[in-house]
């Protein structure tokens, strides 16, 4: 309940999670259909199957070959016409696509599950968090998070710790040591710099986030765990 | 005459070439823009190969806000009066929390803080109303009949609600609906 520095003015972006997984599965990209059409046109332009035999025959009948400059101009003219049509089509199509749910800026799009985090996870400052309700040992928690394609909760800074502490109960974090003679390390093997309370107790070799501070605990005890996935 | 014709065709070819090039570059720019604007990332489902697009702003909340189930929430750490809280939320183009159901904030059901929410008593309608004017469902807070109508409501995400003086200072939750 103590007053803390307001963070109201520092607003920028964290993603909303719910809308993942509701997207039609087939398309890799929402514009694939249209873009395939556009690219089809472009590909056709790269190898224009313009049948010049007819033209050649006319010239042959007259006993004359057309100057190459004229042929080039004709080909370029046709390419110009096709390109012009493609450009116009594209100009018309893009706003149409945007109006029809394909744009991330439309309200309809926002109803979808966007893909930042799995459903029922929360997003905060470019990370996804799984808020666990079940209790596990530290090792079981580590495995549970791995199976969710994420890591056991890590604390990157004081601000994140304050935020998490305000909404979560005690939770395992991804920090441990082999014994009280060894340094605290993260699950990535990096040295952990922050102070961990009760580090002098040889039986307590796994770390817990507990209301605004970090403390050591018995790795075999059961605690709630949370997972984190950086975006 | 033949030379003149050749020169003319060359001129036409050159002009058409330039037009073609400019059309090609226009098309390229249009396509690039359409790609950037329209691409939507694949769903992040718990599974082996997760590909995340960092730069997409789709369904995103402001920094320091929490995204959950199509909504953005600002969970304050500072304590304010009910009116101050309401104005702070409004200044962020949001409103004090309006609950759809008691498990809406189940991601923070372990929190033991009470937060101001956007519920106040309307003498005119003789009912507890949310900020958008809709009435409080009698199923949301079974104890709401005992609330003092002069007070404002502080809510704990565990489902508890208290009526307290609107001049009291509590933390607060702002909400932005993305749909």
């Amino acid at each position: 309940m103590n007053k803390q520095r307001g963070t109201f003015s520092e607003v920028s972006l964290a993603q909303d999670p719910k809308r993942q997984q509701r997207k039609p599965k087939g398309n890799k990209s929402s514009i694939s259909g249209t873009e395939q059409e556009i690219f089809q046109v472009e590909l056709n332009l790269q190898n224009p199957s313009l049948n010049h035999q007819g033209i050649d025959k006319i010239y042959d009948c007259q006993g004359l070959l057309p100057p190459p400059e004229k042929l080039t101009a004709e080909v370029l003219g046709i390419i110009c016409i096709v390109l012009m049509a493609t450009v116009l089509k594209t100009i018309v199509l893009i706003p149409f696509l945007e109006q029809n749910n394909f744009s991330p800026n439309t309200r309809t799009q926002k109803a979808r599950h966007c893909g930042h985090c799995p459903e029922e996870w929360i997003t905060y400052s470019n990370s996804c968090y799984y808020i666990g309700k079940e209790r596990r040992t530290w090792e079981e928690s580590l495995l549970a998070c791995t199976s969710k394609n994420s890591s056991l909760l890590s604390i990157d800074n004081e601000e994140e710790m304050k935020f998490l502490a305000s909404i979560l109960p005690s939770s395992w974090i991804g920090v441990f040591r082999n014994s009280s003679h060894h340094p605290w390390v993260t699950i990535n093997g990096l040295a952990f710099k922050h102070k961990i309370k009760d580090s002098d107790n040889a039986e307590l070799n796994c770390a817990v986030l507990q209301v605004n501070r970090l403390k050591s605990a018995q790795c075999g005890s059961s605690m709630i765990y949370h997972c984190k996935h950086k975006l | 005459m033949a030379v003149f014709k050749t020169t003319l065709w060359r001129l036409i070819s050159g002009t058409l070439g330039i037009i073609c090039l400019s059309l090609m570059s226009t098309l390229g720019i249009l396509l690039k823009n359409s790609f950037t604007k329209l691409s939507i990332e694949p769903a992040f489902t718990p599974g082996p190969n997760i590909e995340l697009q960092k730069d997409s702003d789709c369904c995103s909340c402001q920094e320091k806000w929490v995204g959950y189930r199509c909504n953005c929430y600002f969970i304050s750490s500072e304590q304010k009066t009910w009116n101050e809280s309401r104005h702070l939320c409004a200044s962020q183009k949001s409103s004090l929390l309006q609950l759809q159901n008691t498990d809406e904030l189940d991601f923070m059901s372990s929190s033991q803080q009470f937060y101001w929410i956007g519920l106040s008593y309307s003498e005119e309608h003789t009912a507890w109303l949310w900020e958008n004017g809709s009435a409080l469902s009698q199923y949301l807070f079974p104890s709401f009949e005992t609330f003092n109508t002069k007070n404002c409501i502080a809510y704990n995400p565990n489902g508890n609600a208290l009526d307290e003086s609107c001049e009291d200072k509590n933390r607060y939750i702002c909400k932005q609906q993305l749909i």
């Epitope: 309940m1 103590n2 209301v211 | 307290e164 003086s165 200072k169």
Partner: antibody, heavy 120, light 107 residues
Framework: EVQLLESGGDLVQPGGSLRLSCAAS????????MHWVRQAPGKGLEWVST????????YYADSVKGRFTLSRDNSKNTLYLQMNSLRAEDTAVYYC?????????????WGQGTLVTVSS | DIQMTQTPSSVSASVGDRVTITCRAS??????LAWYQQKPGKAPKLLIY???SLQSGVPSRFSGSGSGTDFTLTISSLQPEDFATYYC?????????FGQGTKLEIK
């Protein structure tokens, strides 16, 4: 360092009145709810009353409702408990306690207590 | 009102023992529970809050667990200074209520 110092405890006759004070220091007083808890001689702890940080809302145990009034003066960092219509069963050591920052329903710092004796 | 029942009401133990005190709520209180230690003539001291969070400055031999209606305070290895009376308290709703206390005595 958080300090809570109660005063005002005394021997009073049934039906009489007493005003207890609790002077707080070492923390930002107006950020926290405050409580009174009492303990009858040789008995357990009993919650008496709670006041919110700005003093706008008070909560009372049924046993004291209508007789006790809790207030605070944030400018003086002081908590008051006005006790009227005192009864023999109000005899106890009265502790003033600070609310925990994690949740106001926990009492993280206590005063040393002041003894109120109601007897004829 | 929520009733809090502590068991046992008293327990005798020796230094180095592991001691467990239980507290039961008459209705679910999630994890809104605290444990206090009180020595004769002194004010109570907060040990555990939110069922399992250790209050700052409290030795790690004290731990709390439980949720809903059943809660436990454990002292892993009893020290001479731990002989006192222990109370549980629910903070889920007004009126806040305490257990009747468990007196921990030297065997």
């Amino acid at each position: 360092e958080v300090q809570l110092l109660e005063s005002g405890g005394d021997l009073v006759q049934p039906g009489g009145s007493l005003r207890l004070s609790c002077a707080a220091s070492g923390f930002t007083f107006d950020n926290y709810a405050m409580h009174w808890v009492r303990q009858a001689p040789g008995k357990g702890l009993e919650w008496v009353s709670t006041i919110t940080n700005s003093g706008g809302t008070t909560y009372y145990a049924d046993s004291v409702k209508g007789r006790f009034t809790l207030s605070r003066d944030n400018s003086k960092n002081t908590l008051y408990l006005q006790m009227n219509s005192l009864r023999a069963e109000d005899t106890a050591v009265y502790y003033c306690a600070k609310a925990h920052y994690y949740a106001r329903g926990y009492f993280d710092f206590w005063g040393q207590g002041t003894l109120v004796t109601v007897s004829s | 009102d929520i009733q809090m029942t502590q068991t046992p009401s008293s327990v005798s133990a020796s230094v180095g023992d592991r001691v467990t005190i239980t507290c039961r709520a008459s209705q679910g209180i999630s994890s809104w529970l605290a444990w206090y230690q009180q020595k004769p003539g002194k004010a109570p001291k907060l040990l555990i809050y939110a069922a399992s969070s250790l209050q700052s400055g409290v030795p790690s031999r004290f731990s709390g667990s439980g949720s809903g209606t059943d809660f436990t305070l454990t002292i892993s290895s009893l020290q001479p200074e731990d002989f006192a009376t222990y109370y549980c308290q629910q903070a889920n709703s007004f009126p806040y209520t305490f257990g009747q206390g468990t007196k921990l005595e030297i065997k």
